[in-house]
């Protein structure tokens, strides 16, 4: 007698490993013999699909080599024209041993930055990821964390974080290890011991000592008055990432000696500097007043700023006033390379006129200080931001020598033009090149109508009350 199909063994959930065989059985009783079709996620499996084998009149579906994409709901449907079609469904869960799909790579990082070592994994059940540093499991802390993705994140990298790392992916089916990678921590060059200033007699031997560290170990070079050291012997030693350099000098003139420690980080360099002055005791020019004398300026640094053949005051408290004052300007001038184009010409004029003050000749040559109002104009109009930074550095003792203190006058201690117009020096007009100086820093929102031929004149930002007394 005709009999409608009945599925006697309903489909069950099947667990299978990748690359293994998985079989679903759909036993059917019916008369006449039914037609059995199979679907995966409601999509018909074609009889000629070579990834599958369908046997026993369609009652057995075999996946010949399971892939992780085969997971899903499989259904068999039986129909023989008697009664309705019947269906049974079961799930295929593809189990997978851990696999590291994005392994970590060697990393070079600068101390203090953030490092991320990738470790992306696959597997079912989802693998847990841990890390090994050297031979020991890595412990997480406030700086070191294993992210959800499995990657290792290290905040504020320290020297001690350097070493060999590997990630470990683990689930119930097995464990996978990445290859070992190296985390190298680089450290900016830093001076541990700065050379000390000396006041010595003519013809003395002096040894300047400079110690620096960094990763990689820095090199040390010595600069004398802005140029590479031309005389003297240098001895160096390296121990435990610390380089020690000693410069031995035979002193015949005063000078400014700078120790420069440099190391390389990829394409970039880091540099640390420290300077010392060598002055010569009891070494004054004969037949000069003991405070100073007037002479024409013969230096280079202030050539463009001081009037041609300007008579300047040379201070005999220095062993060699011309050279010492030129060094002072030179040192401070180098600091000005980083200031804004608005500030620089004003600061240069102030600096040169302050260190090489106008000289009033007479029985007692007298320096003529800059007028207070010109100093204030430079401080508050042209160089407001830079001045604040410089003063802060001075208070915090970031300047090693007194040079910067000497370089920048204290405006309030200078004479006012109101007191005696001849007792103080005016700074020359500051010319601004329209091409070089595109904007004058706008420090307020006010925009007065100002017609300034020597300054750029865009309507919005070129001169909105700038250089300005309004510093916001």
């Amino acid at each position: 007698l005709p009999k409608a199909p009945v599925i006697t063994t309903p489909l069950e959930t099947v667990d299978a490993l990748v690359e293994e065989v998985a079989t679903f059985m759909c036993a059917v009783e019916s008369y006449p013999q039914p037609e059995i079709s199979w679907t995966r996620n409601k999509i018909l499996i074609k009889l000629f699909d070579t990834r599958y084998s369908i046997r026993e009149n369609g009652q057995l579906l075999t996946i010949l080599s399971v892939e992780d994409s085969d997971d899903g709901i499989y259904c068999c449907t039986a129909n023989n024209g008697v009664g309705g079609a019947v269906e049974s469904c079961g799930a295929l869960q593809v189990k997978m041993k851990p696999k590291i799909t994005r392994p970590p790579i060697n990393v070079k990082i600068i101390e203090g930055l953030k490092a991320v070592l990738p470790c992306t994994t696959m597997g079912n059940p989802k693998p847990s990821v841990s890390w090994i540093k050297g031979d020991s499991p890595l412990r997480e802390n406030s700086r070191i964390a294993v992210l959800e993705s499995g990657s290792l994140r290290i905040h504020n990298v320290q020297k001690e974080d350097a070493g060999q790392y590997r990630c470990v992916a683990k689930n119930s089916l097995g464990t996978a290890y990445s290859k070992v990678v190296k985390l190298e921590v680089e450290v900016f060059a830093r001076i541990l011991r700065a050379p000390e200033s000396h006041n010595v007699t003519f013809g003395s031997f002096v040894t300047l000592h400079c110690t620096a560290t960094g990763i990689p170990v820095p090199t040390i070079t010595w600069i004398e008055n802005g140029n590479a050291v031309s005389s003297g012997s240098i001895q160096e030693s390296v121990k435990d990432r610390v380089i020690d350099s000693r410069l031995q000098l035979f002193i015949t003139k005063p000078g400014l000696y700078t120790c420069i420690a440099t190391n390389k980080h990829g394409e970039k360099f880091s540099t640390a500097k420290a300077a010392a002055t060598i002055s010569i005791a009891e070494w004054s020019k004969p037949q000069k007043d003991n405070k100073g004398y007037c002479a024409q300026y013969r230096g280079e640094v202030c050539n463009a700023v001081l009037a041609k053949d300007a008579l300047v005051f040379l201070n005999t408290s220095y062993a060699d006033p011309e050279e010492a004052q030129e060094l002072l300007v030179h040192t401070a001038w180098n600091e000005l390379k980083v200031v804004s184009p608005v500030c620089r010409p004003a600061a240069e004029a102030l600096l040169c006129n302050h260190i090489f003050q106008e000289c009033s000749p007479g029985v007692v040559p007298t320096p003529i200080p800059i007028c207070r109002e010109y100093c204030l104009a430079v401080k508050e109009l042209f160089c407001a931001k830079e001045w604040l930074v410089m003063e802060e550095k001075t208070h915090r003792g970031l300047y090693r020598s007194e040079m910067h203190l000497l370089s920048v006058p204290e405006c309030s201690k200078l004479p006012s033009m109101h007191w005696d117009p001849t007792a103080c020096a005016r700074l020359p007009h500051l010319d601004y090149n329209k091409e070089n100086l595109k904007t004058f820093p706008p420090m307020t929102s006010s925009k007065p109508s100002v017609d300034i031929p020597n300054l750029p004149s865009s309507s919005s930002s070129s001169f909105s009350v700038s250089p300005t007394y309004s510093m916001t």
Partner: antibody
Framework: EVQLVESGGGLVQPGGSLRLSCAAS????????IHWVRQAPGKGLEWVAS????????SYADSVKGRFTISADTSKNTAYLQMNSLRAEDTAVYYC?????????????????WGQGTLVTVSS | DIQMTQSPSSLSASVGDRVTITCRAS??????VAWYQQKPGKAPKLLIY???SLYSGVPSRFSGSRSGTDFTLTISSLQPEDFATYYC?????????FGQGTKVEIK
């Protein structure tokens, strides 16, 4: 002795024009900054305009911008204020004052010398 | 624009009193602040320049000081000739503004 003498004030109808002069002696206009400051009857001081001859630069208060023009003739050591499109609210005593130095330092010097003032009345 | 708010607008004091007048700038300004004295029918006279410098010929009882955006004129011991109106003034390059004035009257 430093002196500033204003002239050119008077009665003018709204929309009319006047030119004020400020004759300086005892100093050179070219090395100083000259300012015009006005004071409406019973009111406070209001800055009008400034000029620094050494820079040839000028500046104006918003209330007069486009209507007033400040200038200086260094050969005559005199500064001027050309006032056009006058309004009733421009009625005031107009003072000229000087501050020593160019545009950058003059603010620190204060206006140390003032003229006696000249009255401008704008009325129909 | 920078506003200079002067206070008080008027005050009554006796000879010998210590008098303080304050000007507050609406935003940070430099030390280019001056103080003037004006008597009725006369031009103003400069007393203090650069916030705290005493102009020549001005009695030492007048002094100026600064604290941030606050500028102060102090008369240490008021004299009969000091009864007048006082103005503060700040200078930009150039954007000049005056305070509204403080009238010092006899009590």
């Amino acid at each position: 002795e430093v002196q500033l003498v204003e002239s050119g004030g008077g009665l003018v109808q709204p929309g009319g024009s006047l030119r004020l002069s400020c004759a300086a002696s005892g100093f050179t206009v070219s090395s100083s900054s000259i300012h015009w400051v006005r004071q409406a009857p019973g009111k406070g001081l209001e800055w009008v305009a400034s000029i620094s001859s050494s820079y040839g630069s000028t500046s104006y208060a918003d209330s007069v911008k486009g209507r007033f023009t400040i200038s200086a003739d260094t050969s005559k050591n005199t500064a001027y204020l050309q006032m056009n499109s006058l309004r009733a609210e421009d009625t005031a005593v107009y003072y000229c004052a000087r501050s020593e130095g160019d545009r950058y330092v003059s603010g620190y010097m204060g206006m140390d010398y003032w003229g006696q003032g000249t009255l401008v009345t704008v009325s129909s | 624009d920078i506003q200079m708010t002067q206070s008080p607008s008027s005050l009554s004091a006796s000879v010998g009193d210590r008098v303080t007048i304050t000007c507050r700038a609406s935003q940070s300004v430099s030390s280019a602040v001056a103080w003037y004295q004006q008597k009725p029918g006369k031009a103003p006279k400069l007393l203090i320049y650069s916030a705290s410098s005493l102009y020549s010929g001005v009695p030492s009882r007048f002094s100026g000081s600064r604290s941030g955006t606050d500028f102060t004129l102090t008369i240490s011991s008021l004299q009969p000739e000091d009864f007048a109106t006082y103005y503060c003034q700040q200078s930009g390059v150039w954007l000049i503004t005056f305070g509204q004035g403080t009238k010092v009257e006899i009590k």
